[in-house]
């Protein structure tokens, strides 16, 4: 059992969904779990999140906000063998740029 490389980081806009892949060479009976190292608290034990969503073990986080930030790590286990762990993907949550004060619709400008 071995893991493919995962992206070092993933940038998602506030309110969008984040999709994390856990590529591995295992057969379908592999058990994929996801863990998070909390942003700014890297000495804390990783936090257990739950299983992957599909046979590939994808993690989907809906409607992300700033508190979702952190490093997401997947672990893959076949049978009762020791698990393999990804290096982790850092989730960055991007604030959408504020609308400029003068960003008016055309109808407003012409009044």
């Amino acid at each position: 059992l071995w893991m493919h490389k995962v992206p070092a980081s993933l940038m998602v806009s506030l309110g969008e969904d984040a999709h994390f892949q856990c590529p591995h060479n295992s057969s379908n009976n592999a058990n994929v779990t996801w863990w998070r190292v909390l942003h700014g608290n890297y000495t804390w034990p990783p936090e257990f999140l739950g299983p992957g969503e599909d046979p590939n073990g994808t993690l989907i986080i809906q409607n992300v906000n700033k508190s979702h930030g952190g490093i997401y790590v997947c672990r893959v286990q076949e049978g009762n063998e020791s698990y393999q762990q990804s290096c982790g993907t850092y989730l960055r949550v991007r604030q959408p740029p504020p609308r400029p004060f003068l960003d008016m619709g055309e109808g407003t400008k012409n009044r």
Partner: antibody, heavy 116, light 110 residues
């Protein structure tokens, strides 16, 4: 502070239905797989059902398979358990819980009584 | 999905140490070591005492310790106190989003 607040319990006749809700606050709800655990009067804890973070994966104990349906509304930070064809042996306190690791959270439970 | 096996009851005098065992199969425990121990007082929700086999959450007394060897997990309580009297449950991750609990152990402080 993390809070899980269950509601929807009550008295129902055998064969009837109930829908339990669990409103979550103080945690990144959409990140977590969530679970329902029950405890019959004077008995031990029994895992009932679980659901992945986005709702794509659902899991059931054999004792409730085909009768109970777990779901979640991530826009409302709420977990649900639809219970159909209820039996006397389903009488229990039902807890909503995020299980596993240090971020382990439980509600205070809601009592479901199935009796004629 | 059969329950993990725990002794129905254990007892000890104040100041003594007791150990509660929790036995399952290799598929119950896997290699994740996602074994938790809960304390439950009557009418209350379970309280996490040990996670991942041997780690203690903040706020839990260091009199509580956990270990795991093969297909058996153990909870040890040293320096027993009256407030330790409660029911104790082990719980293990069993893959997917499925979990299995032990049948529970009633601890009596004599």
């Amino acid at each position: 502070e993390v809070q899980l607040l269950e509601s929807g319990g009550g008295l129902v006749q055998p064969g009837g239905s109930l829908r339990l809700s669990c409103a979550a606050s103080g945690l990144t709800f959409t990140s977590y797989a969530m679970n329902w655990v029950r405890q019959a009067p004077g008995k031990g804890l029994e895992w009932v059902s679980g659901i992945s973070g986005s709702g794509g994966g659902t899991y059931y104990a054999d004792s409730v398979k085909g009768r109970f349906t777990i779901s979640r509304d991530n826009s409302k930070n709420t977990l649900y358990l639809q219970m159909n064809s209820l039996r006397a042996e389903d009488t229990a306190v039902y807890y909503c819980a995020k299980l596993g690791g240090w971020s382990d959270y439980w509600g205070q439970g809601t009592l479901v009584t199935v009796s004629s | 999905q059969s329950a993990l096996t725990q002794p129905a009851s254990v007892s000890g005098s104040p100041g003594q140490s007791i150990t509660i065992s929790c036995t399952g199969t290799s598929s119950d425990f896997g290699s994740y070591n996602l074994v938790s121990w809960y304390q439950q007082h009557p009418g209350k929700a379970p309280k996490l005492m040990i996670y991942e086999g041997s780690k203690r959450p903040s706020g839990v007394s260091n009199r509580f310790s956990g270990s795991k060897s093969g297909n058996t997990a153990s909870l040890t309580i040293s320096g027993l106190q009256a407030e330790d009297e409660a029911d104790y449950y082990c719980c293990s991750y069993a893959g997917g989003s499925t979990w299995v609990f032990g049948g529970g152990t009633k601890l009596t402080v004599l």
